[in-house]
């Protein structure tokens, strides 16, 4: 339940955070899960625990395995697991899928590529950036704090970007690299402030208790491919995913393009077996893009 995957390369630093929430004053104990052997806190060890963090300085392939962290909070101990895999360095330039962090998308107007996991490390600027193993050079590339900005993004800027930085621990330096894919969204057309086509703002929908009902949130964002265009439902101002009611489900947004070229998205909220308590909820249709957020509210009322 409270398990997190982490990975790194041999001879590089790897720092892993306990997946359980902690507070600065609470001790965190780390163990090798298989042996239940405690991980030392002394910094002279290659692998040592430092509060919420487990540090491999540097990592070895043999370090791979599951590590248990226990947050010694008062009242209850909170247990988490870090599933660590250390890989051998690749002889060629190819970065295998299992070493890749989440893909990010960019466009002409927005081309930030964040260096994954960097906030766990004690690093100093500047970061080094590589694309398909080639060091990035030229005025189009700007390494800014923990991210890379590319000016005038073009489709051939897509690829695998690796950030490289130095982690410093007590005067010793360790190299860290992290790679993620960058995709470029085509931006022919335009983007504008979202327009919600349905529902009308402050609409009321009549429903029958015990029946199923669907609410459609439909919004348009401009013409052509959109960098960011999301349509979602919220209940009482909270995400559907935070709302543990299996009767109420949100479908994946369905993209639509009309004959006039408008880029629109529909998201359907399905409510099974409508209950009295559902009439008390506020249903918000949210449409969001880079220009901002528009919200239309709909409520349910009982059919007479």
């Amino acid at each position: 339940k409270f398990s997190k995957q982490s990975w790194g390369l041999e001879n590089e630093a790897l720092i892993v955070r306990c997946p359980r929430q902690g507070k600065s004053s609470y001790i965190v104990d780390w163990y090798y899960s298989q042996t239940n052997k405690s991980i030392p806190t002394q910094e002279r060890n290659r692998v040592f625990a430092s509060g919420q963090l487990l540090k491999f300085l540097p990592a070895e392939v043999a370090d791979s395995g599951i590590y248990t962290c226990i947050v010694r909070s008062p009242t209850f101990n909170r247990t988490g697991y870090a599933n660590v895999t250390i890989y051998k360095k690749q002889p060629d330039c190819n970065v295998p899928d299992y070493l890749m962090y989440s893909t990010v998308s960019g466009s002409e107007k927005n081309s930030k590529i964040y260096c994954p996991t960097i906030d766990l490390y004690n690093w100093t600027a500047p970061l080094e950036w590589f694309k398909n193993c080639q060091a990035l050079q030229g005025s189009r590339y700007k390494a800014h704090k923990s991210f890379l900005v590319i000016d005038n993004v073009m489709t051939d800027d897509a690829g695998d970007y690796t950030c490289k930085f130095i982690h410093n621990e007590n005067g010793a330096n360790y190299s860290v690299t992290a790679t993620r894919s960058f995709t470029v969204k085509d931006e022919q057309g335009f983007s504008r402030f979202p327009v919600i086509r349905a529902p009308a703002h402050n609409e009321t929908k009549e429903v029958e208790i015990g029946e199923n009902t669907n609410l459609t949130c439909s919004a348009c964002f401009g013409k052509g491919a959109q960098f960011l265009a999301t349509v979602q439902w919220q209940l009482n101002g909270n995400k559907i995913t935070d709302f543990s009611e299996p009767r109420i489900q949100q479908e994946e947004g369905q993209n639509q393009s009309f004959s006039n070229g408008l880029a629109c998205v529909n998201t359907v909220l399905r409510i099974a077996d409508v209950k009295e308590e559902d009439l008390l909820l506020r249903y918000d249709c949210l449409a969001l893009n880079l220009h901002g957020l528009r919200r239309h509210t709909i409520r349910l009322s009982r059919k007479n």
Epitope: Q21, K23, S25, Y26, T75, F76, R78, D242
Partner: antibody, heavy 123, light 111 residues
Framework: EVQLVESGGGLVQPGGSLRLSCAAS????????MHWVRQVPGKGLEWISS???????YYPGSVKGRFTISRENARNSLYLQMNSLRAGDTAVYYC?????????????????WGQGTTVTVSS | NIVMTQTPLSLSVTPGQPASISCKSS???????????LFWYLQKPGQPPQLLIY???NRFSGVPDRFSGSGSGTDFTLKISRVEAEDVGVYSC????????FGPGTKVDIK
Amino acid sequence: EVQLVESGGGLVQPGGSLRLSCAASGFTFSTFDMHWVRQVPGKGLEWISSIDTEGDTYYPGSVKGRFTISRENARNSLYLQMNSLRAGDTAVYYCTRGEDWSDDDYYYGLDVWGQGTTVTVSS
Amino acid sequence: NIVMTQTPLSLSVTPGQPASISCKSSQSLLHSDGKTYLFWYLQKPGQPPQLLIYGVSNRFSGVPDRFSGSGSGTDFTLKISRVEAEDVGVYSCMQSLQLFTFGPGTKVDIK
């Protein structure tokens, strides 16, 4: 105003089930651990279950396997599903607020309590 | 399990006079974070418990300064410097170092 309001108590036969609810308002519910404490009439207070901000649950042996605590952050609600009820479960059940995990220094124990809901197990 | 005991179990006090309640735990309530997880509650008739003292000696907001807590490790005391009529009820100590356990309560009434 910070408030907890319990509901769902009542009379139930031994072996029966009951679901208690607690509606929270006036604070960021999702950042607090939440708890149920009961009090047998004329007796002391007894802790019976807890749920932390990440959804982990805790019970004493007396109710483990029979009671299930859950929370619905979107509804600012805490629940206690009580099965296989016994006469010894007859008590006033209080919903109470615990540690705030959004505040590094915050720990006031069980600082906010509801008015309680009465559960009577009797044939 | 940590066991909490209280003495006395009942107390009759003259208004304006001091009162003292003792609470003992079966093991130290000092946590590795340096705090001691001992609390005092007052339950007035027909009401839920209300927090008086947290962390042994800190008065909760709105609690009159006639209430004070002291102690360390396993021995703790709640003192009321001058008892008032509104102070009647059952006073309980609670530990939250390991799960939660309450003392049996001390019933305070006015002579």
